[in-house]
Interface confidence: medium
Amino acid sequence: SAHAHPRDSCPLGPGRCCHLETVQATLEDLGWSDWVLSPRQLQLSMCVGECPHLYRSANTHAQIKARLHGLQPDKVPAPCCVPSSYTPVVLMHRTDSGVSLQTYDDLVARGCHCA
Amino acid sequence: SAHAHPRDSCPLGPGRCCHLETVQATLEDLGWSDWVLSPRQLQLSMCVGECPHLYRSANTHAQIKARLHGLQPDKVPAPCCVPSSYTPVVLMHRTDSGVSLQTYDDLVARGCHCA
């Protein structure tokens, strides 16, 4: 099939390949302090790390990209580490009528892959 | 709202920001020459280019990532250019019983964004 098996062990050493990492950010960091009330600090999971050949390939396109990057590194970029899924979070914010709770579905990464 | 407006004009100059580019690849390049019969050459659209602050942000997460990259560039990577959608392609390939046509939904990028 078109799918070579995505590799899950990192050939670059521990913590170097695409993975989920938690970054603390305040509302001030995000520029949201004027409208978001709570929480004032968010635990933001983000995708960081490198994408060596076939590591956690998102799909066939990513596998092709990895292969062509090996052949034409100046023309085709390596796959990069991006969210594969998200964890919804709740923010409390100001509205015209007071305060409300709102869910954001695409704010915090839950999983990562190489695309 | 959490969504600042993603920027669509490239501040780095023409062709430098995240966009779709066509790459020619033979079945030999892809390592598929033993099982794919046709086409012998593929026009592969791929996502290339940089993702400056808020350019074509995929979602709220990407906007946050861009902002935190500005604050902590060593810790948080910049968003990167990946497919937002795909164009299905049909490949003719060998099977145990002869030849068949198969559609691949995730092989050729149709649009790009910064994630």
Partner: antibody, heavy 119, light 107 residues
Framework: QVQLVQSGAEVKKPGASVKVSCKAS????????INWVRQAPGQGLEWMGW????????NYAQKLQGRVTMTTDTSTSTAYMELRSLRSDDTAVYYC????????????WGQGTMVTVSS | DIQMTQSPSSVSASVGDRVTITCRAS??????LAWYQQKPGKAPKLLIY???SLQSGVPSRFSGSGSGTDFTLTISSLQPEDFATYYC?????????FGGGTKVEIK
């Protein structure tokens, strides 16, 4: 560790007011909101309202609107809940609780303050 | 307001039993449901948040599931210290609301 410590039990006459305090420690007070929840004897939990410690913005339960006021003092990391025009059916244990947080949980609770309204 | 309906209101069980408590929201609340345990004279304790995430320090015999309007708390093997009252709570929107509680009693 994260703790919310409330003021002691109160006995009040109908028509009076009560002010319960809730002192936070072990976390950044202004990073969360404080909920007030009460529980009448033998009954379930009733949410009274919420205040953000950071800005003082509030959201009160409709049935208590006009009788309840929630405030915070960031210099002492303390939240307050004042309930006025007390009636016998306000007799309850009053809890402060931190949250909701990022995942909508109310995760840390005070030990509770018993308020008895009796003539 | 979103009404939270818990069932059963009480359940008699023995140590080692599997106990399931359900909670139904009057409208969709995504995954914004928490479960609390309360023992007499004590404050509630958070067990499960975001419908299925186990709070740190809570034994793995407790699990939560569900999304939208129907949710379940399961205690896989009831222990003596689990006899208590359990409440569900939604934080999808204000006002925050609680279920009526389920008392787990010794059979």
């Amino acid at each position: 560790q994260v703790q919310l410590v409330q003021s002691g039990a109160e006995v009040k006459k109908p028509g009076a007011s009560v002010k319960v305090s809730c002192k936070a420690s072990g976390y950044t007070f202004t990073s969360y909101g404080i909920n007030w929840v009460r529980q009448a004897p033998g009954q379930g939990l009733e949410w009274m309202g919420w205040i953000t410690a950071y800005s003082g913005d509030t959201n009160y339960a409709q049935k208590l609107q006009g009788r309840v006021t929630m405030t915070t003092d960031t210099s002492t990391s303390t939240a307050y809940m004042e309930l006025r025009s007390l009636r016998s059916d306000d007799t309850a244990v009053y809890y402060c609780a931190r949250g909701p947080g990022q995942y909508a949980d109310v995760d840390v609770w005070g030990q509770g303050t018993m308020v008895t309204v009796s003539s | 307001d979103i009404q939270m309906t818990q069932s059963p209101s009480s359940v008699s069980a023995s140590v080692g039993d599997r106990v399931t408590i359900t909670c139904r929201a009057s409208q969709g609340i995504s995954s914004w449901l928490a479960w609390y345990q309360q023992k007499p004279g004590k404050a509630p304790k958070l067990l499960i948040y975001a419908a299925s995430s186990l709070q740190s320090g809570v034994p793995s015999r407790f699990s939560g599931s569900g999304s939208g309007t129907d949710f379940t708390l399961t205690i896989s093997s009831l222990q003596p210290e689990d006899f208590a009252t359990y409440y569900c709570q939604q934080a999808n929107s204000f006002p925050i609301t609680f279920g009526g509680g389920t008392k787990v009693e010794i059979k």
